[in-house]
């Protein structure tokens, strides 16, 4: 799996999970989240050569097409596969609210 | 939806479905498929600015992050959303076989 266990250890050019810490205020301009101040969002990036963690038959076809036609810009892309939620604390007036924001943390990647 | 009805009519730079005809023999080196000789595979490409057909909360966060930090290359990617199968005819010896290859045709796209 193209997850932290593999990707953070084996830094490489192909599609993999990349660490990314996002500070809500500085990086997003969000002042409404009280806690946490930021979180490890991570993201997916890197090349998708033929058969590198292809998600579908179409992405396999596309990466093979791109190998044979390298001048074409039709190639698969490295995107998130498994995502996890993030629990946040914010206030409505003086009332604290705890909410789970779904699909906030990327845990693994794929070529799609 | 970023499908043919929208994307083939409104040519644009943002993430959208792009037409792509693949000739099995010429583009993939596949000689085993007897019929069809090729098919409209299509593919997804284009920019993923903030809120342009974002797939998840993470892709929305990432595109906003990329807007505020434009020098970072951590941005969502335009990938396939809905896919359809393709029916093919091939031979094993002299015996014709009809098979449905799943997820071969892209029908719509998303920013993920």
């Amino acid at each position: 799996a193209l997850d932290a266990a593999y990707c953070f250890r084996n830094v490489q050019d192909n599609c993999c999970l990349r660490p990314l810490y996002i500070d809500f205020k500085r990086d997003l301009g969000w002042k409404w989240i009280h806690e946490p101040k930021g979180y490890n969002a991570n993201f997916c990036a890197g090349a998708c050569p033929y058969l590198w963690s292809s998600d579908t038959q179409h992405s396999r076809v596309l990466s093979l097409y791109n190998t044979i036609n390298p001048e074409a810009s039709a190639s698969p892309c490295c995107v998130s596969q498994d995502l996890e939620p993030l629990t946040i604390l914010y206030y409505i007036g003086k009332t604290p609210k705890i909410e789970q924001l779904s699909n906030m943390i990327v845990k693994s990647c794929k070529c799609s | 939806a970023l499908d043919a009805a929208y994307c083939f009519r409104n040519v644009q730079d943002n993430c959208c479905l792009r037409p792509l005809y693949i000739d099995f023999k010429r583009d993939l080196g596949w000689k085993w498929i007897h019929e069809p000789k090729g098919y409209n595979a299509n593919f997804c490409a284009g920019a993923c600015p903030y809120l342009w057909s974002s797939d998840t909360q993470h892709s929305r966060v990432l595109s906003l992050y990329n807007t505020i930090n434009p020098e970072a290359s951590a941005s969502p990617c335009c990938v396939s959303q809905d896919l359809e199968p393709l029916t093919i005819l091939y031979y094993i010896g002299k015996t014709p076989k009809i098979e449905q290859l799943s997820n071969m045709i892209v029908k719509s796209c998303k920013c993920s």
């Epitope: 932290a4 953070f8 250890r9 084996n10 830094v11 490489q12 990349r18 660490p19 990314l20 810490y21 993201f43 990036a45 890197g46 | 930090n69 020098e71 970072a72 290359s73 951590a74």
Partner: nanobody
Framework: QLQLVESGGGLVQPGGSLTLSCAAS????????MSWVRQAPGKGLEWVSV????????IYSDSVKGRFAIARDNAKNTLYLQMNSLKPEDTAVYYC????????????RGQGTQVTVSS
């Protein structure tokens, strides 16, 4: 709070050597890949090197390949950059960064350490 403190810079003659250090705190250092980036006077940030979380994989930019060596000591939460055969064009402020700076450019946390290569 994540903190990175660079040290070891200085003035060196062309062909000379220096070793930069980066002390990390506020996060699980051993879990993350780490990078070195640099900023020459009047230029943007340039990625120099990245190392995997366990130190096994190392990648270098073409401009420093064969001259610089990245290393880490997870027990000491420290990242290193051994710089050999230094050239005037290596003159820059050097920063360490958490993660792979090939993909997240333009982000520095520490103050950096100045390296000047001049005769």
């Amino acid at each position: 709070q994540l903190q990175l403190v660079e040290s070891g810079g200085g003035l060196v003659q062309p062909g000379g050597s220096l070793t930069l250090s980066c002390a990390a705190s506020g996060f699980t250092f051993s879990h993350y890949p780490m990078s070195w980036v640099r900023q020459a006077p009047g230029k943007g940030l340039e990625w120099v090197s990245v190392i995997g979380s366990d130190g096994g994989t190392k990648i270098y930019s073409d401009s420093v390949k064969g001259r610089f060596a990245i290393a880490r000591d997870n027990a000491k939460n420290t990242l290193y950059l051994q710089m050999n055969s230094l050239k005037p064009e290596d003159t820059a402020v050097y920063y360490c960064a958490e993660g792979d700076s090939r993909y997240v450019r333009g982000r520095t946390r520490g103050q950096g350490t100045q390296v000047t290569v001049s005769s």
